[in-house]
Amino acid sequence: CKAMHVAQPAVVLASSRGIASFVCEYASPGKATEVRVTVLRQADSQVTEVCAATYMMGNELTFLDDSICTGTSSGNQVNLTIQGLRAMDTGLYICKVELMYPPPYYLGIGNGTQIYVIDPEPCPDSDF
C-alpha cells in the first residue's frame, strides 16, 4: 500500500485560555528526512491553512514567528499546539503531512480534530 496514514484525535477541548493541543502521528511508508506539517481548518466546504512548518527528522519544528502554532516532533509523531483560539474558531482542524525528501514524495491527510473553544465568562464585578 502506497498511501500514508495520518492519525489524530477526533475531539479536543481548548483550554480557557484558548490553547488546544493534539498529536498528529503518521505511518511513514519510506525513510523521510525532511517533512512538512500543515494544519488546515475546514469550515463548511472551505479549507484554509492555519500554519505550516518544515522540519528535518530529529530536529525541532519551526513555525514562522507570527504563527499561532507551536510544535515538537518525536519520530513519526508531531505534538501540535494552537494558541489564541476563540469560540468562533471552533471547527475541524486537519493535520496534513508531506514527506518532501528523499523521493518518493508522500501526502498524508488526517481525518481532522474537532476543536471546541468556549470563550471564558467575564469575571463579575466584586462589591466590597
Partner: antibody, heavy 118, light 108 residues
C-alpha cells in the same frame, strides 16, 4: 480573479529548447505546491513535474528527467519549465496546475502548445 | 508507480440516463488521494471529485464518487448535455502523480 496563465509555447526543432511560464494571480502563490501536466494531441493527461512551496524540492516524470527543469519565483508569482533536448514525443499542450490544500489539482491554466518538429 | 486503469474506454449513454465509470489501481490508494476530472475538447481539465467522494466547489450533486483500496467509481446520476466529455481519475498520494487513460462519455 484566481487564475493561472501559461505562455512560452511554440514550434521548436528536435534538440532545441523552450521555456514555459505560468503566471498566477488571485491567491497566495507561495502557499501552494505546483505542477506541470501535459497532453499529447488526442491522448490523455501525463504528469510532468512538481515543485514544493519554496522551490527546494522538485520531482520529474522519468520521461523528462535530466532534460526538463522546473522552478518558481514566489516574488513574481510565477512558475517555469525549462525544456531542453526536446523530442518529437514532447509535442503536447502543457498545463500548469495548482495543488489544492488537500492534494488534488484544483486550478489549471488554459494550456500552451509545444510542437517539436523538423 | 501506481497505474490507474479506467473502463470502459468509451461509454455511449442517452441524456437523462445514468453513467458509471470505473477506475482500478495497480496497488492500494488511500481514498483520501483519489480524484476525478472532467475535460471537454479544447479546455483544461476541471476537478470534479477529490478524496474519492467529496465534490469540488461548484460541482452539481448529480456527480458522485465512491470506492476504496483499488476500486473507485464515478457516477453521473442523470446525464445533462454538458456532461458529455472525457473523464480522468488520478492518484495524488505519492509520486509520481498518475492519471488513468480516460473514459469518453458520448451521446448515444
Amino acid at each position: 480573479e484566481v487564475q493561472l496563465v501559461e505562455s512560452g509555447g511554440g514550434l521548436v526543432k528536435p534538440g532545441g529548447s523552450l521555456r514555459l511560464s505560468c503566471a498566477a494571480s488571485g491567491f497566495t502563490f507561495s502557499s501552494y505546491t505546483m505542477h506541470w501536466v501535459r497532453q499529447a494531441p488526442g491522448k490523455g493527461l501525463e504528469w510532468v513535474s512538481f515543485i514544493s512551496y519554496d522551490g527546494n524540492y522538485k520531482y520529474y516524470a522519468d520521461s523528462v528527467k535530466g532534460r526538463f527543469t522546473i522552478s518558481r519565483d514566489n516574488a513574481k508569482n510565477s512558475l517555469y519549465l525549462q525544456m531542453n533536448s526536446l523530442r518529437a514525443e514532447d509535442t503536447a499542450v502543457y498545463y500548469c496546475a495548482r495543488t489544492s490544500l488537500l492534494g488534488p489539482f484544483d486550478l489549471w491554466g488554459q494550456g500552451t502548445m509545444v510542437t517539436v518538429s523538423s | 508507480e501506481i497505474v490507474l486503469t479506467q473502463s470502459p474506454g468509451t461509454l455511449s449513454v442517452s441524456p437523462g440516463e445514468r453513467a458509471t465509470l470505473s477506475c482500478r489501481a495497480s496497488q492500494s490508494v488511500g481514498s483520501s488521494y483519489l480524484a476525478w476530472y472532467q475535460q471537454k475538447p479544447g479546455q483544461a481539465p476541471r476537478l470534479l471529485i477529490y478524496g474519492a467522494f467529496s465534490r469540488a466547489t461548484g460541482i452539481p450533486d448529480r456527480f458522485s464518487g465512491s470506492g476504496s483500496g483499488t476500486d473507485f467509481t464515478l457516477t453521473i446520476s442523470r446525464l445533462e448535455p454538458e456532461d458529455f466529455a472525457v473523464y480522468y481519475c488520478q492518484q495524488y498520494g505519492s509520486s509520481p502523480w498518475t492519471f488513468g487513460q480516460g473514459t469518453k462519455v458520448e451521446i448515444k
